[in-house]
């Protein structure tokens, strides 16, 4: 058993049918010695008397808020949560496996640049009685500070007969050095509590591996005289790291016909302009990627040919 926060304790339960459970001793936080009784949640049933209460925790029915009283007065509370292990594996029931980029991916994180700021998000089908707490650091043995805000509900979507809820959190490395080579990964730890169930989830990454630039901005077309060609131009996104001479992007320019089956013409360039043939009813799209490190491409920025 360990303390999650004041008066909230997590009991680690290795569960299997007929498991004996965990013996837990609760101590009433009071100088009183006599006339103390214990109850669980809203029940008035007395579970025991004395300054300590020994319970056998076998299942969620044994978790909850234990209260010690004396003469009708509440002395202290202890909320017991369960962290359940089955077949040697800690439960991961609260969050949904996003399966991207691999199975057992519960947390996904992205950064728009090298400033040390990043966003993580996760999915759940649970709508109520749910709380999250996020901590982060760079490295784990001698951790350097990363400050995370509160997790917030960022999206709701319907998937078949299921409603899915997306939560996200923004974090900022306290002493980020954008140009430095990373040697220690960022660690992100999410505590999730649903009703009386506690679970924890972790992710470990280098900022360079989670970079996804914003799409190029100010995408414009300039027709070339007496030609079907156009000059496409764009700019670096405002959120990208500066100076651009050091934090450089490479770009992919795509001409896509109205039909998805039509052949796509693609041009790759390090410049912020390109000359392409603009077909009728086609659109031109441009996306960006770090020039020197193959992290994610940005989403596309698009304009119609007409």
């Amino acid at each position: 058993i360990w303390e999650l926060k004041k008066d909230v304790y997590v009991v680690e339960l290795d569960w299997y049918p007929d498991a004996p459970g965990e013996m837990v001793v609760l101590t009433c936080d009071t100088p009183e010695e006599d006339g103390i009784t214990w109850t669980l949640d809203q029940s008035s049933e007395v579970l025991g008397s004395g300054k300590t209460l020994t319970i056998q925790v076998k299942e969620f029915g044994d978790a909850g808020q234990y209260t010690c009283h004396k003469g009708g007065e509440v002395l202290s509370h202890s909320l017991l949560l369960l962290h359940k292990k089955e077949d040697g594996i800690w439960s991961t029931d609260i969050l949904k496996d996003q399966k991207e980029p691999k199975n057992k991916t519960f947390l996904r994180c992205e950064a728009k640049n090298y400033s040390g700021r990043f966003t993580c998000w996760w999915l759940t089908t649970i709508s109520t009685d749910l709380t999250f707490s996020v901590k982060s650091s760079r490295g784990s043995s001698d951790p350097q500070g990363v400050t995370c805000g509160a997790a917030t509900l960022s999206a709701e979507r319907v998937r078949g007969d299921n409603k899915e809820y997306e939560y996200s959190v923004e974090c900022q490395e306290d002493s980020a050095c954008p140009a430095a080579e990373e040697s220690l990964p960022i660690e992100v730890m999410v505590d999730a509590v649903h009703k009386l169930k506690y679970e924890n989830y972790t992710s470990s990454f280098f900022i360079r591996d989670i970079i996804k630039p914003d799409p190029p901005k100010n995408l414009q077309l300039k027709p070339l005289k007496n030609s079907r060609q156009v000059e496409v131009s764009w700019e670096y996104p405002d959120t990208w790291s500066t100076p651009h001479s050091y934090f450089s992007l490479t770009f992919c320019v795509q001409v896509q016909g109205k039909s998805k089956r039509e052949k796509k013409d693609r041009v790759f360039t390090d410049k912020t302009s390109a000359t392409v043939i603009c077909r009728k009813n086609a659109s031109i799209s441009v996306r960006a990627q770090d020039r020197y490190y193959s992290s994610s491409w940005s989403e596309w920025a698009s304009v119609p040919c007409s």
Partner: nanobody, 123 residues
């Protein structure tokens, strides 16, 4: 929301068997741990059995262990309670419940409930 409808109750002789079914509709059935409870007249609702969302783990009240079997079919959105060697003291209204905490024998840990099906065991 999850809607639960129990069926399969009836009157049987002591020692006989009965199979209860609980059909779920609404939100995705496979997200939920499922349980069976029962209530005899003048008594509190009593835990019978529960099964986790995968169908890989089960948990039973001592009073039914070895006689009752809970199972589920996530493709059919149905949970079953196979009851054998029935005794007169098994007479009760049987309720199906859906929740998110497994295992739990406490009724308030379940979020959705059916209307119940009557089982009567005569001696």
């Amino acid at each position: 929301e999850v809607q639960l409808v129990e069926s399969g109750g009836g009157v049987v002789q002591a020692g006989e068997s009965l199979r209860l079914s609980c059909a779920a509709s609404g939100r995705s059935f496979s997200n939920f741990e499922m349980g069976w409870f029962r209530q005899a007249p003048g008594t509190e609702r009593e835990f019978v059995a529960t099964i986790n969302w995968r169908g890989s783990s089960t948990y039973y009240a001592d009073s039914v262990k070895g006689r009752f079997t809970i199972s589920r079919d996530n493709a059919e959105n149905t949970v079953y309670l196979q009851m054998s060697s029935l005794k007169p003291e098994d007479t009760a209204v049987y309720y199906c419940a859906a929740g998110r905490l497994f295992p739990s024998s406490r009724s308030r840990d379940y979020d959705y409930w059916g209307q119940g099906t009557q089982v009567t065991v005569s001696s």
